[in-house]
């Protein structure tokens, strides 16, 4: 608010007032009269820059008059009372109401005193964020989408992620005239490492007290990535039975595990139990390449592991033997 002048009457009002589309707003405007100063006010006038005539007048004897009587109202001025408060209420704010307004006091003996107020017409946007489920493509694709609908002015959308990625933001007119819908896509080359990770869409707007944060959990569909664990290159005859595990990462989840060898079906000492393969004790050395084949909705992938059971030394080693 501008500081009052010294020794003179001054009109006090904010330089800018925000109002929401469709709502009502009060344009505050007061005459500040220093203690020793005497003033008499006979008229209050509101006019809009660029338009001919005044939109609202409060006259000392005639009372209030409005260019649009259903949309305007002096909130405090009353006939027979001192006219020091020219605050004007506007109902049913429209986009075209945005602009500069002059609040003016006709005073004696100072003459007229006025101030300009900028009315900002805002519309609070609705925000949504959603994952764009993708498959491995080898090139950048939208992986998340953030939409801020019906904002005025347009919302600002930014993305926050440790994964890199590039935003692609566009605007289209909103459903209500003068509003804007902003869509931002977060683009990255899909990989299995990204699946299940989070990115955050940050939406900023004049109407928000603080930015809105919307988290998106990324989804990348990919065929199984397979490895076999449980073998330490150190298996010997006479050691306990052992278990190999077929480790598969995939999205969607694996639908089937199939164990085999490079020679065909599993030998008798190997028993498949889903993702696990039980290796029973053997009484002679073996050298076999095992294959685990994992299937999901996108395809099948396999891993191979060559297992050797050697003649041998110390019984302290874990390994394969009959108890």
């Amino acid at each position: 608010w501008p500081p009052p002048g010294t020794g003179d009457v001054v009109v006090q009002a904010p330089t800018q007032v925000p109002g929401f589309l469709g709502d009502s707003v009060t344009l505050p405007c007061y005459l500040q009269v220093p203690n020793m100063e005497v003033t008499h006010v006979s008229q209050l006038t509101w006019a809009r820059h660029g338009e001919s005539g005044s939109m609202a007048v409060f006259h000392q004897t005639q009372g209030p008059s409005y260019s649009e009587s259903k949309r305007l109202e002096f909130v405090a001025a009353r006939l027979g009372a001192e006219l020091r408060n020219a605050s004007l209420r506007m109902f049913g704010l429209r986009v075209e109401d945005e602009g500069n307004y002059t609040c003016l006091f006709v005073t004696f003996p100072q003459g007229s005193r006025s101030v300009d107020i900028w009315l900002r017409v805002l519309a609070k946007p609705q925000n949504t964020a959603e994952v764009q489920k993708v498959q491995l493509t080898g090139e950048p694709v939208p992986m998340a989408r953030c939409v801020s609908t019906g904002g005025r002015p347009p919302a600002q959308i930014t993305w926050h992620s440790d994964l890199g990625g590039m935003p692609n933001t566009s605007q289209v007119p909103g459903f209500l005239s003068g509003t804007v819908t902003v869509t931002s896509l977060w683009i990255l080359v899909p990989s299995s490492q990204v699946d299940g990770k989070n990115v955050t869409c940050k939406v900023e707007h004049e109407s928000f007290e603080k930015p809105q944060l919307l988290t998106v959990n990324l989804t990348v569909y990919y065929p199984p990535e397979v490895s076999i664990s449980g073998y330490d290159n150190n298996w010997y005859l006479g050691q306990n039975e052992a278990t190999l595990t077929c480790d598969a990462r995939s999205n969607p989840e694996p639908t089937g595990y199939n164990w085999s060898t490079t020679m065909g079906p599993l030998p008798p000492f190997a028993v498949a139990q889903g993702a696990q393969l039980l290796i029973r004790p053997v009484d002679k050395p073996i050298n076999t390449t095992l294959i685990c084949n994992v299937t999901n909705a996108l395809g099948a992938r396999q891993a191979e592991l060559t297992v050797q059971v050697k003649e041998g030394p110390p019984s302290e080693h874990s390994g394969i033997s009959r108890n």
Epitope: V38, H40, Q43, T45, Q60, Q62, S65, P109, S114
Partner: antibody, heavy 116, light 107 residues
């Protein structure tokens, strides 16, 4: 009913003074500023000055500064305009008018003639 | 001082005619303009305030418009009783000033 009733016509010699009165009724005298406007015969209107009855605060047209004095008597709800050092070009009808930014009520006018 | 230049200075029109009187201010006066009607031998009577608002009791054939420096008083359908002189006045700043008047005669 708002009424502003002015004193009668005056014939004055150049150099003399004239004091015109304006008695009001039908409204609260102290709530409205009272102004004086003059109109030479067949000519336009000229604002002289005004006074707020409550505070006694005045504002004068620079053209009359030093020659005009506007006063009020709150007890009788009457405003006065005194013009001194009269000259022939001061011959005009003098009106009191209630101020509402514009002037919504006027007295009937007082003809002041300055002639030797 | 702000000059108020009125035109025309005199005009005649017939009953039923649309009459327009203009007033030009030498500087911006916003909408702080009033219009008065003065019949012969009478004081002025307020018609319009704040450039476009009619005083109560004033017939709606009288209308005012304008802001800034250019103002208009319109009589939409002239009546015989509208024979008078019309003045504009600015009350944006002191000293208040008036137009020189437009004398309206009935043909």
């Amino acid at each position: 009913e708002v009424q502003l009733v002015q004193s009668g016509s005056e014939l004055k010699k150049p150099g003399a003074s004239v004091k015109v009165s304006c008695k009001t009724s039908g409204y609260t005298f102290t709530e409205y500023t009272m102004h004086w406007v003059r109109q030479p015969h067949g000519k336009g209107l000229e604002w002289i000055g005004g006074i707020h009855p409550n505070s006694g605060e005045t504002s004068y047209n620079q053209r009359f500064k030093g020659r005009v004095t506007i006063t009020v008597d709150k007890s009788t709800s009457t405003a006065y305009m005194e013009l001194s050092s009269l000259r022939s070009e001061d011959t005009a009808v003098y009106y009191c008018a209630r101020w509402t930014g514009d002037f919504d009520y006027w007295g009937q006018g007082t003809l002041v003639t300055v002639s030797s | 001082d702000i000059q108020m230049t009125q035109s025309p200075s005199a005009m005649s029109a017939s009953v039923g005619d649309r009459v327009t009187i203009t007033c030009k201010a030498s500087q911006n006066v916003g909408t702080n303009v009033a219009w008065y009607q003065q019949k012969p031998g009478q004081p002025p009577k307020a018609l319009i305030y704040s450039a476009s608002y009619r005083y109560s009791g004033v017939p709606d054939r009288f209308s005012g418009s304008g802001s800034g420096t250019d103002f208009t008083l319109t009589i939409s359908s002239l009546q015989a009783e509208d024979l008078a002189e019309y003045f504009c006045q600015q009350y944006e700043s002191y000293p208040y000033t008036f137009g020189q008047g437009t004398k309206l005669e009935i043909k």
